[in-house]
Structures are given as C-alpha cells and as structure tokens.
C-alpha cells in the first residue's frame, strides 16, 4: 500500500483512508447504478498489480462524457505520480480484452478492498 | 444466507487454554474479515481481535495481553479464537462476528455465541 | 484506543415514544460507527452502519445520524418488540471499541 503516499490532498493522508475514500466511491457507483454505467462503454482491462492504479486510470480516462465516474479518474490520477493523458497504455493493460466499464469497477472494487483488508491485518 | 455457528459450552479451570471454533457459510470466506468479542456476565461488548482469512493476517485487543490467538482455516471455512492463561474474569460468553467493512460493516452477521466457564 | 462514551446508560420509555441514544468518541471516527441491538441470552444484530445506512430488513423507525465525533441513534416511535440493549462500535481504526451500552426499559 506504500505506493497510495502520493494520494493528491491538502494534508498529509494515510494511505489507508486515502484507500478507504477511494473504495467508498466504487462502492457509491456500484449501488446507485441505474442504466448501464457510462452508456456501456468498454475499456482496456488490466492487471490488478502493483502499477495498477496509473493503468485503471489510463483506462478509465479513455471515457469522456460520464460523469458517473469523474470522481473516480479525480481520486486515481492522485494515486499516479505521472501524469496520464487519453491514449496512453502501460504494459499492465491486457490489450486484447475490453469490457465494460461497470464490470472494470467492479472488478477494481473487489481488488481493492482485498488491498484494503491486507492492509488492515499486516 | 450468511450464517456463523459456533462450537458448544466449554467448562475451564483457572491456566487452561480454550479454543472456540466458528464455521461459516453463505458467502466466500475470504471475503469478509472475521472479529472475535467477549461479553462477561451482564457486562457490555468488548472486541478481542480479528483476522483477515486471506492471508491470516491478525490484529488484537492489547487488553488481552497476548493471550488471544486467532487463526482462519480456508480449507474448512472456519475460524478459530485460542484464549490461554484463563481466569475466572475470562468467564463470558464469546462471540464471532463477520461482515464486507463497506457494506453492512464488519460485524454484519454474528455467531450465536459460546459461553467459556473458569472455574476451579 | 479510541473511547465512545454512550449516554444515557438506561432509560425508560412507553410504546410509541421517540428514542434518542448518542455516542461519543474520543477523536474523529470518519463516520465509521456500527448500532446494535442486543436482547437478553441473544446475539448482537445490526441495525446500522456507516453511522446512518440501515441494514436491509431493520425497520424505518431506526435511524441513525451525525459525523465527526458524535453519533445518534433514534427510534421515531417504539414498538414493544424495541425494548433491549444497544450499542454503538466505532470501526474507524484498531482497536475497535464499543460504547457501554444503553438498556432500554418499559416505563
């Protein structure tokens, strides 16, 4: 979890509420879900390594236009110490597989709050 | 459906250990960290210690002094709470208790109990 | 450790009153903060979480309220079957720690 210190915030965060905040509003998405999340976009999926925050967001700044998740792009570009622009790709980007945009955060949500759990009993 | 049940009644003598399991089902086990608490006769809610069953991580009430040992074994879905050195204040009725930490929070679903006597 | 300090430690009441119940804690707990109702010889069951989001098939009359170190739990109109204990959890940071309790009596 030491690679959430770069969190974007007036003070200083711990890593694990920079986490939690993060978590919550994947949670809030997944919830208040009414109609396909993001028009049903598709984006790159990726691997839930240790670079992954930089490439959700590579993959997630790909969609323009959803308000459902500007939030999320907001939080994640805090957790990348580079600046990511629309149409970059990492090596962590499984490149010939696109899903949808609801199953990405799902898949993120879970992954994180594994993260979040390790974190919690280390 | 979610459900947590413990093992039975145990009768101990002063410097015995105890162990209390609790086997769950209705969910992933890995999922949801697992909490142990302790409620002495007509006294409040008092948490021991938890774990998460991933990875066997623990964390711990240091009013227990290191006396409290938790484990999770993901082969049978259950999780185990080892109290040693006994006293008689340790008589209670013990508790499990599980939950997702973001939806429910992490003491969701609780095991029915098991009531630990020390006596001599 | 962080302290959640429950007031009043018991209380009567008549069917159909409102119930307030508050907690305290030491420090900013983030809203982090569980309410249980416990009967006698019984399990704990949750009732809140998340200081106001009420467990699926708690009945609306339970509702819970507040931020940063002070938290409420209200019973709008209580129901004979509401007469029992509670208590509320922070679960912001380790060690969690519950409050002392609340014993709600028939007046």
């Known amino acids: 979890l030491t690679c959430l210190g770069g969190f974007a915030s007036p003070g200083p965060v711990p890593p694990s509420t920079a986490l939690r905040e993060l978590i919550e509003e994947l949670v809030n998405i997944t919830q208040n879900q009414k109609a396909p999340l993001c028009n049903g976009s598709m984006v790159w999926s990726i691997n839930l390594t240790a670079g992954m925050y930089c490439a959700a967001l590579e993959s997630l700044i790909n969609v323009s236009g959803c308000s459902a998740i500007e939030k999320t792009q907001r939080m994640l570009s805090g957790f990348c110490p580079h600046k990511v622009s629309a149409g970059q790709f990492s090596s962590l980007h499984v490149r010939d597989t696109k899903i949808e945009v609801a199953q990405f955060v799902k898949d993120l949500l879970l992954h994180l709050k594994k993260l979040f759990r390790e974190g919690q009993f280390n | 459906e979610v459900q947590l049940v413990q093992s039975g009644a145990e009768v101990k003598k002063p410097g015995a250990t105890v162990k209390i399991s609790c086997k769950v089902s209705?969910?992933?086990?890995?999922?949801?960290?697992m909490h142990w608490v302790q409620q002495a006769p007509g006294k409040g809610l008092e948490w021991m210690g938890g774990?998460?069953?991933?990875?066997?991580?623990?964390a711990s009430n240091q009013k227990f002094k290191g006396r409290v040992t938790i484990t999770a074994d993901k082969s049978t879905d259950t999780a185990y709470m080892e109290l040693s050195s006994l006293r008689s204040e340790d008589t209670a009725v013990y508790y499990c208790?599980?939950?997702?930490?973001f939806g429910g929070g992490p003491f969701a679903y609780w095991g029915q109990g098991t009531l630990v006597t020390v006596s001599s | 450790d962080i302290k959640m300090t429950q007031s009043p430690s018991s209380l009567s009441a008549s069917v159909g009153d409102r119930v307030t119940i508050t907690c305290k804690a030491s420090?900013?707990?983030?809203?982090?903060l569980s309410w249980f109702q416990q009967k006698p010889g019984k399990a704990p069951k949750t009732l809140i979480y998340?200081?106001?989001r009420l467990v699926d098939g708690v009945p609306s009359r339970f509702s819970g309220s507040g931020s940063g170190q002070d938290y409420t739990l209200t019973i709008s109109s209580l129901d004979p079957e509401d007469f029992a204990t509670y208590y509320c959890?922070?679960?912001?940071?380790?060690?969690?720690?519950f409050g002392g309790g609340t014993k709600v009596e028939i007046k």
């Open positions: 774990i998460d069953p991933e990875t066997g991580g623990t």
């Open positions: 959890l922070q679960y912001d940071e380790f060690p969690y720690t």
């Open positions: 208790a599980t939950g997702d930490y």
């Open positions: 998340r200081a106001n």
């Open positions: 209705g969910y992933t086990f890995t999922d949801y960290e």
């Open positions: 420090q900013d707990i983030n809203s982090y």
